[in-house]
């Protein structure tokens, strides 16, 4: 698994480098998670033909995965820093149950799946420090999450593979949108 941001030997070997700003740290953290997702997607796509599934087929799912919409203020048109930041944090918190589901779904990339999950927790902490209006952030209900997890794990094998593929694809898209928005802040 790749070394998490801020822990690679090059940082230690270069004492004169300027410490990363909060924004740079967040940017680096997101890119690190995206690398992890790419590795997981590679295993998923090699194992089955899920990656060839049409967008239409994937759209008809029972999941409620976070997605960026115009009203969230993260797009260039109608950009709103505070609203957008709340959406990013809320979305990441909602993704956590799906990242938990991904654990034990990979044979050769088990560590990678754990790294994505842990790095996302760190990213949430970074963003929460940046956010002023923490009251607007709703945390998912643990009981609801627990029953959702049970339901996802009860699916037949093909559905579980399809769900894994969809979670990775949606999480990647959400992080890419977040990265673009955060670069405007």
């Amino acid at each position: 698994a790749p070394v998490p941001p801020g822990e690679d030997s090059k940082d230690v070997a270069a004492p004169h480098r300027q410490p990363l700003t909060s924004s740079e740290r967040i940017d680096k953290q997101i890119r690190y998670i995206l690398d992890g997702i790419s590795a997981l997607r590679k295993e998923t796509c090699n194992k089955s033909n899920m990656c060839e599934s049409s967008k239409e087929a994937l759209a008809e799912n029972n999941l409620n995965l976070p997605k960026m919409a115009e009203k969230d203020g993260c797009f260039q048109s109608g950009f709103n820093e505070e609203t957008c930041l709340v959406k990013i944090i809320t979305g990441l918190l909602e993704f956590e149950v799906y990242l938990e589901y991904l654990q034990n779904r990979f044979e050769s990339s088990e560590e990678q799946a754990r790294a994505v999950q842990m790095s996302t927790k760190v990213l949430i902490q970074f963003l929460q420090k940046k956010a002023k209006n923490l009251d607007a952030i709703t945390t998912p209900d643990p009981t609801t999450n627990a029953s959702l997890l049970t339901k996802l794990q009860a699916q037949n094998q093909w559905l579980q593979d399809m769900t894994t593929h969809l979670i990775l694809r949606s999480f990647k898209e959400f992080l890419q949108s977040s990265l673009r928005a955060l670069r405007q802040m």
């Epitope: 087929a57 994937l58 037949n156 093909w158 559905l159």
Partner: antibody, heavy 120, light 111 residues
């Protein structure tokens, strides 16, 4: 021709164990999931569990956990169902069935069934 | 577990007429545009035989008089025209979740 050949009828005493076999021909069990289903006289069908012979991963209905053990021997292309601590409630016909991985999820080939009678 | 309720428990239909068997699931068995509902026919002393998979797809070698429909929680199996050979027990089965579950069965006879 794709077939599942099951072992013959068994008459066993209460408290004993029994091991049923299901031998596949016309396909490799490693490419499928092998399931076991119970049917009591004049009753419905109950799923017991399944094995993925490629990695010996098993799943059971909680009500058969501890009662049933599913195994597979890929060299003989055979799946097994072992039932322990038998009681009259275990008197039934036991079917093995094949399930192929894919978009649709169904039992397409069934064995003829093995009748297990528990009696002293 | 997903509970499947079949109705009626028994049915008598005249030769050449239509037989309709219903199956209701305790929750939706749909996902990704697929209905994970299958139908089986079972004759005395024989194993179940696949008739319909994915709610409406015919199993291999199944006569065209057998058809399935429905989505979500409500499904039905239609047999038309009814033939002598169709006297049997019919079961619905969901494969969306583990454990896969079966309906209680419908006994179809000739009137």
């Amino acid at each position: 021709e794709v077939q599942l050949q099951q072992s013959g009828a068994k008459l066993v005493k209460p408290g004993a164990s029994v091991k049923l076999s299901c031998t596949a021909s016309g396909f490799n069990i490693k490419d499928t999931y092998m399931h076991w289903v119970k049917q009591r006289p004049e009753q419905g069908l109950e799923w017991i569990g399944r094995i993925d012979p490629a990695n010996v991963n098993t799943k059971y209905d909680p009500k058969f956990q501890g009662k049933a053990t599913i195994t597979a021997d890929t060299s003989s292309n055979t799946a097994y169902l072992q039932l322990s601590s038998l009681t009259s409630e275990d008197t039934a016909v036991y079917y093995c069935a094949r399930l192929l991985y894919g978009r649709y999820w169904y039992f397409d080939v069934w064995g003829a069934g093995t009748t297990v009678t528990v009696s002293s | 577990d997903i509970v499947l309720t079949q109705s009626p428990a028994s049915l008598a239909v005249s030769l050449g007429q239509r037989a309709t068997i219903s199956c209701r699931a305790s929750e939706s068995v749909d996902n990704y545009g697929i209905s994970f509902m299958n139908w089986f026919q079972q004759k005395p002393g024989q194993p179940p035989k696949l008739l319909i998979y994915g709610a409406s797809n015919q199993g291999s070698g199944v006569p065209a008089r057998f058809s399935g429909s429905g989505s979500g929680t409500d499904f039905s199996l239609n047999i038309h025209p009814m033939e002598e050979d169709d006297t049997a027990m019919y079961f619905c089965q969901q494969s969306k979740e583990v454990p896969p579950t079966f309906g209680g069965g419908t006994k179809l006879e000739i009137k």
